[in-house]
Interface confidence: low
């Protein structure tokens, strides 16, 4: 995806996971200068901001995801020990200093480990 000099690549747009897994929401971007990266989470319950940061600086992680997420300077984030309630749409927006931006979405499906799956 590319817009106004910001390009964004999402290698895996849909991720299937089971509870308690650590999940990498992987992206790559390129743009002029140092952008602001923002991830938001949407589900049937609404939308909330997860984290916002400029690569090379400390991330501003929302209270709802404190200690549950870490950021990488390529724009990716890792979610720790996911639960079923983490299922939903994860939207990344990469914004250049002058305001141009691009967004992309990763869909995360988290399921319980069923007893029969263990046999």
């Amino acid at each position: 995806l590319q817009s106004q000099g910001v390009s964004l690549y999402i290698p895996q747009a849909t991720i299937n996971a089971t509870v308690k897994e650590d999940i990498l929401l992987s992206v790559e971007y390129s743009c002029h200068g140092v952008p602001t990266i923002e991830w938001t989470y949407s589900s049937n319950w609404g939308t909330q901001k997860i984290v916002e940061w400029k690569p090379g600086t400390q991330a501003n992680i929302s209270q709802s995801h404190k200690d549950r997420v870490c950021t990488f300077d390529n724009g990716s984030i890792q979610l720790f020990s996911v639960g079923v309630r983490d299922s939903g749409y994860y939207v990344i927006t990469v914004t250049e200093r002058l305001g141009s931006s691009q967004f992309g979405t990763i869909v995360l499906h988290v399921s319980e480990i069923l007893y029969e799956d263990l046999h």
């Epitope: 602001t36 901001k49 927006t93 250049e96 002058l98 305001g99 931006s101």
Partner: antibody, heavy 121, light 111 residues
């Protein structure tokens, strides 16, 4: 439910000033960039100004640059537009709009109902 | 700075489908846009954000009858099963380096 309610419009003489307000509710106001967009009678939409979530970045349309100032008070969940040196061509309905994101001027996922500003002698 | 071009008017029959077009100026074919609807005497309403590859994210409560697609520098809004309340002005919008740009709007009449 997200609500944006504009106020402060009215009839004003050319060269005078006016301040518009937009009261926001139903979302975390301090987390999102906010815009003003206007619509002259019978015309299309024209973007006026944007301010980032924390007020650190502001951008203006060329037509209002140097005359209008956008600001916000996150403690009051309120967006402002200070309009100075008003001209007849500033006559329009002024809409407050919420950006989808915090920093970037991208697009608006919620709009207010607007307040009418009429500049006439 | 990008320029967005829209037809000034369009019409279609109740229950039919209509496809509105927004054209990006030369050199801006990769830009994402948004579509907004403005019913008579009301404020605008956000419909969707539309990427150059056709992927889109819709606003809260926007019916499935509204969909977006892209081809080159063209961005489309398709409304199927037209209803009387779809009669409105439709604006496309894009964003760039500290600026916002609107198309001139398309007035949709439902016959």
């Amino acid at each position: 439910e997200v609500q944006l309610v504009e106020s402060g419009g009215g009839l004003v003489q050319p060269g005078r000033s006016l301040r518009l307000s937009c009261a926001a509710s139903g979302f975390t106001f301090s987390s999102y960039a906010m815009h003003w967009v206007r619509q002259a009678p019978g015309k299309g939409l024209e973007w006026v100004a944007v301010i980032s979530y924390d007020g650190s970045n502001k951008y203006y349309a060329d037509s209002v640059k140097g005359r209008f100032t956008i600001s916000r008070d996150n403690s009051k969940n309120t967006l402002y537009l200070q309009m100075n040196s008003l001209r007849a061509e500033d006559t329009a309905v002024y809409y407050c709009a919420k950006d989808q994101y915090s920093v970037g001027a991208t697009t608006y996922d919620y709009w207010g109902q607007g307040t009418l500003v009429t500049v006439s002698s | 700075q990008p320029v967005l071009t829209q037809s000034s008017s369009a019409s279609a029959s109740l229950g039919a489908s209509v496809k509105l077009t927004c054209s990006l100026s030369s050199g801006h074919s990769s830009y994402a846009i948004a579509w907004h609807q403005q019913q008579p005497e009301k404020g605008p309403r956000y419909l969707m954000k539309l990427n150059s590859d056709g992927s889109h994210s819709k606003g809260d409560g926007i019916p499935d009858r509204f969909s977006g697609s892209s081809s080159g520098a063209e961005r489309y809004l398709t409304i199927s099963s037209l209803q009387s309340e779809d009669e409105a002005d439709y604006y496309c919008q894009t964003w760039g380096s500290g600026i916002q740009v609107f198309g001139g709007g398309t007035k949709l009449t439902v016959l």
